[in-house]
Amino acid sequence: SAASCPPISLPAAASRSSMDGAGAEEVLAPLRLAVRQQGDLVRKLKEDKAPQVDVDKAVAELKARKRVLEAKELALQPKDDIVDRAKMEDTLKRRFFYDQAFAIYGGVSGLYDFGPVGCALKNNIIQTWRQHFIQEEQILEIDCTMLTPEPVLKTSGHVDKFADFMVKDVKNGECFRADHLLKAHLQKLMSDKKCSVEKKSEMESVLAQLDNYGQQELADLFVNYNVKSPITGNDLSPPVSFNLMFKTFIGPGGNMPGYLRPETAQGIFLNFKRLLEFNQGKLPFAAAQIGNSFRNEISPRSGLIRVREFTMAEIEHFVDPSEKDHPKFQNVADLHLYLYSAKAQVSGQSARKMRLGDAVEQGVINNTVLGYFIGRIYLYLTKVGISPDKLRFRQHMENEMAHYACDCWDAESKTSYGWIEIVGCADRSCYDLSCHARATKVPLVAEKPLKEPKTVNVVQFEPSKGAIGKAYKKDAKLVMEYLAICDECYITEMEMLLNEKGEFTIETEGKTFQLTKDMINVKRFQKTLYVEEVVPNVIEPSFGLGRIMYTVFEHTFHVREGDEQRTFFSFPAVVAPFKCSVLPLSQNQEFMPFVKELSEALTRHGVSHKVDDSSGSIGRRYARTDEIGVAFGVTIDFDTVNKTPHTATLRDRDSMRQIRAEISELPSIVQDLANGNITWADVEARYPLFEGQETGKKETIEE
């Protein structure tokens, strides 16, 4: 095909799993160059105004080459950088962090239940989010319904654009995502030693354009390559478009179709007017919502990464487009983080560590509002346990942008699944508010007093009431209302159509109307304004809390040195499911009042904790609490009972070091640790280190 070509062949050395920097770079250099040259081609095609189909093919090839480069970069990284997923998942399932939903009925893929530990962790991640964003920025939090009437999602573009192609096993009805299945099938064919160079080249070309194929092209490819169900070997149905939203009907009549929301954002846009009023009509302001969203993934296969019901936390920051400047940007300007700009991606470069202030100054990040949120997102993610070295912000390339966005940066984390998107930070421009305003005829705008009155050129539709009334009778009112709220950009576009073709079409409330020259013309005049109407731009940070949580699992999972069986999660104290454990060294009755007293005091201090008075050795009990990420451990030992003042030991999970302090002090120490007011190093500086028992009893708390 015209603008696609198989990615260049890998040097032999590329099969090695990890190597030194120079060796790795030697392997990556040709792949970087291949991306770069494809980037040049895309640019040239655009310059030459080549047909869109050719640009799309070239872009698909660019993305394919990018994927090859990225996969190789990941493969060349040191093996100890990658978590033992099987071991981690065993711990997560065994300790009931989460499990497949409806497990006793055989489970449903893409649906999960969180157990006590997972639930506590998730709540803490959400609570930290509230403090970090809602409280810090004085954001207006709302809670909207999940059920959404169809017209809302029609207007937002989700009904038309939120779809994938799907194929079905003709015998058992099992569904597969067409692109995923075709990709896996072609990769299998290509790995066959008997596959000729020409055939391989042809298949690579198909893979490169996978994102661009329409329904019929996909159907032909399934036939050409004889794709069958990978599970049963049965024939597959032709691909059909499958909308990823869960459809339902609101009310018993079945005449009000709706969907479970695919994102929480729409609820905020629809309440914009009320929120603006609540904010005394002033921009900028932000609104947020935390709640579940739903996507009917065709065949979810990646654990918590791809699910059908998931918790999102979304902020919509409404800003005057002429004032995209954040007063608090300086607070984050000195952060250094990995940025992977669109330019770097098409040049085959890696993400590069940059000071945020420099990134905005150099135009890598468009404005300080976007820059501020990127900085705050970074601080939040690292606060909850994501490793800064496995976190990058990747800018969407022009062709990847969602239908509503004009610039977008994703926070991506490096996991055993590769780089996964965990937060999207999109500049949605004025897409949503404009769409909903046009559909509902409710102007979703803010008013801004002008320093000086100004004379402006006005462009309006001037409809002929008579002609429209004659043509559309009782629907004429609909047409007139629609025409009254069209913006200048839209009017100018329609005027061009009117001049070129003598007519244009509008769509409102599900009805289509054709307007001809005798029904409408365009009026231009001047008027003096004292206030200015502003359609706010929207910066939207959107957090996938399940993916964040999964990343935290991977980035904090460790195996104790020298003991493969002892695993633990080093959750930061602020999100740890339990802040501390209370462990009596013995089941002796005289220990119990101290356990009770300490537990009650911890509760009074708001410190979630777990009492483990089971009979196992103290070392085994530490291991058990470490395994679920309990941040600290208080041990009531014989010295607690036998000596005054009554003291106990406090153990840090990560270093396994201990100090000794009075029982009465421990709740506030743990509370301060959990809130991040002090660090373990501060605690060690203030209290004596504890290295063994003083009473000579047989059972010690040394590990």
């Epitope: 015209a2 070509c5 260049i8 062949s9 040709p30 160059l33 770069r36 040049d40 081609l41």
Partner: antibody, heavy 116, light 110 residues
């Protein structure tokens, strides 16, 4: 309008050195990879060298490796080719061209003659 | 000795269609795009076809390119006297880590 203008050619003795320059205008020079291509009198085109937009990587033909050095100064919109240990077979018109595998704009060339 | 092989010469009468072939290997044409350049007498080369079959703006649609496997060809239909020039094919070569040209084909319009 995109323009590439080579300079610095001339007569040089075998073993000598020469530095060619290519002044670019009409496009964002710092956003493009650049190359040098040469053509011996009455012969075909031969690729010489290429450099990334940020100077991060350079490539050379085997025939010039170790003797020629490609570089650029984005603040001056200029591409350079430092040629050392010149040989008679390096005699050619040297062109600078935009990109590394899709030479969409070429300069008019500068003649380098290596002769004693 | 060029890495890509082109016939040294080709000819045709005005209005005729001529094709110029270019053959290489899996490390160049087989795995990368082919580009064609036109060099009119006494001038610098000019981009004629890129990405196997794309014409830059300003190049007449009489010129077309194609590629199959490890070979490529340039077709010129409706030959005109001003098409008399040297034509070069080129492609990036992955195993040489460099760009390679064909030896050039001198087209004569009779």
């Amino acid at each position: 309008e995109v323009q590439l203008l080579e300079s610095g050619g001339g007569l040089v003795q075998p073993g000598g050195s020469l530095r060619l320059s290519c002044a670019a205008s009409g496009f964002t020079f710092s956003g493009y990879d650049m190359s040098w291509v040469r053509q011996a009198p009455g012969k075909g085109l031969e690729w010489v060298s290429a450099i990334y937009s940020d100077s991060g990587s350079t490539y050379y033909a085997d025939s010039v490796k170790g003797r020629f050095t490609i570089s650029r100064d984005n603040s001056k919109n200029t591409l350079y080719l430092q040629m050392n240990s010149l040989r008679a077979e390096d005699t050619a018109v040297y062109y600078c061209a935009r990109n590394t595998a899709l030479f969409d704009y070429w300069g008019q060339g500068t003649l380098v003659t290596v002769s004693s | 000795q060029s890495v890509l092989t082109q016939p040294p010469s080709a000819s045709g009468t005005p209005g005729q269609r001529v094709t110029i072939s270019c053959s290489g290997s899996s490390s160049n044409i087989g795995s990368n795009y082919v580009t064609w350049y036109q060099q009119l007498p006494g001038t610098a080369p000019k981009l004629l076809i890129y990405a196997n079959n794309h014409r830059p703006s300003g190049v007449p649609d009489r010129f077309s390119g194609s590629k199959s496997g490890t070979s490529a060809s340039l077709a010129i239909s409706g030959l005109r006297s001003e098409d008399e020039a040297d034509y070069y094919c080129g492609a990036w070569d992955a195993s040489l880590s460099g760009y390679v040209f064909g030896g050039g084909t001198k087209l004569t319009v009779l």
